[in-house]
């Protein structure tokens, strides 16, 4: 059992329609061929998923589960993407990734990301 | 309140089959992965399977891969274990647990059901 | 796949007595284990999560120390409800493996 160090944006600021993106680094310490990829989100001290995804190296990272997250990888890196964000998701998200196979199995936990949600104001009504 | 409840266990002849499943109530269900973990009589406590909030991810000790199979309804509320080909090591008391997360961003089995017994005989 | 080895397998003990139940991991599991209390024809119970912190609802007599491969589960002055078989188990990767109880009786 291994530690990993996993790096991620400190503060994210979430687009007017909901949409945050954000990098998740890790430093691979060996050549895993099985990686799982979580997000939790913390908010006071509830710890909820958010998503996860497993996939292979090299190949497309997919979100099952109905997940509110997409996402690509590209070496140690995975780009995730979460929707359908609204001022009460506001909250703290952690990235962490699991090397599953083959061993020995590491597990790293970034700092978390702070993702700012701001709902955007309904358009004024019109006179005509 | 959060309640498990598990049923199907029973007596069954070696090689054979059998349904287990869990009945979840007091909780979103949907929003928690679940696990078995079996128990023989006088023994201690062994993971059986995992199963991910919607079912896209499962996983299995050594012991139970590609004979048992974890899945799950969450329209009915209800986790399931399939077990096939079963074998005299496989009597246990299988309890249904849900996991939670703690601070450590890791899952602990939270939550567990009373138990069903199998008895492979 | 982890061992996780408990000491003792029997411990007899007296109604406000300290005890402690000692945990020791194959490998380096930091922080990353848990205990659970199970009393005979009822599923286990879980005390205490990430080495030290304790479950919602459990005692404030029951806690946990320990990191890396040596955990200790002690129980501060102990009540007659106390009387039970405690396991820990590991959370770090897969199998997640249990210990093999320690059976904790009247003297």
């Known amino acids: 059992c291994k530690a990993m160090h996993v790096a991620q944006p400190a503060v994210v600021l979430a687009s007017s329609r909901g949409i945050a993106s954000f990098v998740c680094e890790y430093a691979s310490p060996g050549k895993a061929t099985e990686v799982r990829v979580t997000v939790l989100r913390q908010a006071d001290s509830q710890v909820t998923e958010v998503c996860a995804a497993t996939y292979m190296m090299g190949n497309e990272l997919t979100f099952l589960d109905d997940s509110i997250c997409t996402g690509t990888s590209s070496g140690n890196q995975v780009n995730l993407t979460i929707q359908g964000l609204r001022a009460m998701d506001t909250g703290l998200y952690i990235c962490k990734v699991e090397l599953m196979y083959p061993p020995p199995y590491y597990l790293g936990i970034g700092n978390g990301t702070q993702i700012y949600v701001i709902d955007p104001e309904p358009c004024p009504d019109s006179d005509f | 309140e959060v309640q498990l409840v598990e049923s199907g266990g029973g007596l069954v002849q070696p090689g054979g089959s059998l349904r287990l499943s869990c009945a979840a109530s007091?909780?979103?269900?949907?929003?928690?992965?679940m696990s078995w973990v079996r128990q023989a009589p006088g023994k201690g406590l062994e993971w059986v399977a995992t199963?991910?909030?919607?079912?896209?991810?499962?996983s299995y000790p050594d012991s139970v891969k590609g004979r048992f199979t974890i899945s799950r309804d969450n329209s009915k509320n209800t986790l399931y274990l399939q077990m096939n080909s079963l074998r005299a090591e496989d009597t246990a008391v299988y309890y249904c647990?849900?996991?939670?997360?703690?601070?450590?961003?890791?899952?602990?089995?939270?939550?567990w059901g009373q138990g069903t017994l199998v008895t492979v005989s | 796949d982890i061992q996780m080895t408990q000491s003792p397998s029997f411990l007899s003990a007296s109604v406000g007595d300290r005890v402690t139940i000692t945990c020791r991991a194959g490998?380096?599991?930091?922080?990353?284990l848990a205990w659970y209390q199970q009393k005979p024809g009822k599923a286990p119970k879980l005390l205490i999560y990430?080495?030290?912190t304790l479950a919602e609802g459990v005692p404030s007599r029951f806690s946990g120390s320990g990191s890396g491969t040596e955990f200790t589960l002690t129980i501060s002055s102990l009540q007659p409800e106390d009387f039970a078989t405690y396991y820990c188990?590991?959370?770090?990767?897969?199998?997640?493996?249990f210990g093999g109880g320690t059976k904790l009786e009247i003297k």
């Open positions: 647990a849900r996991e939670d997360y703690g601070s450590s961003y890791v899952h602990w089995f939270a939550y």
């Open positions: 007091g909780f979103t269900f949907s929003s928690y992965t």
């Open positions: 199963i991910s909030r919607g079912g896209g991810y499962t």
């Open positions: 490998e380096n599991i930091y922080s990353y």
């Open positions: 990430n080495a030290r």
């Open positions: 188990q590991h959370h770090y990767g897969s199998p997640r493996t």
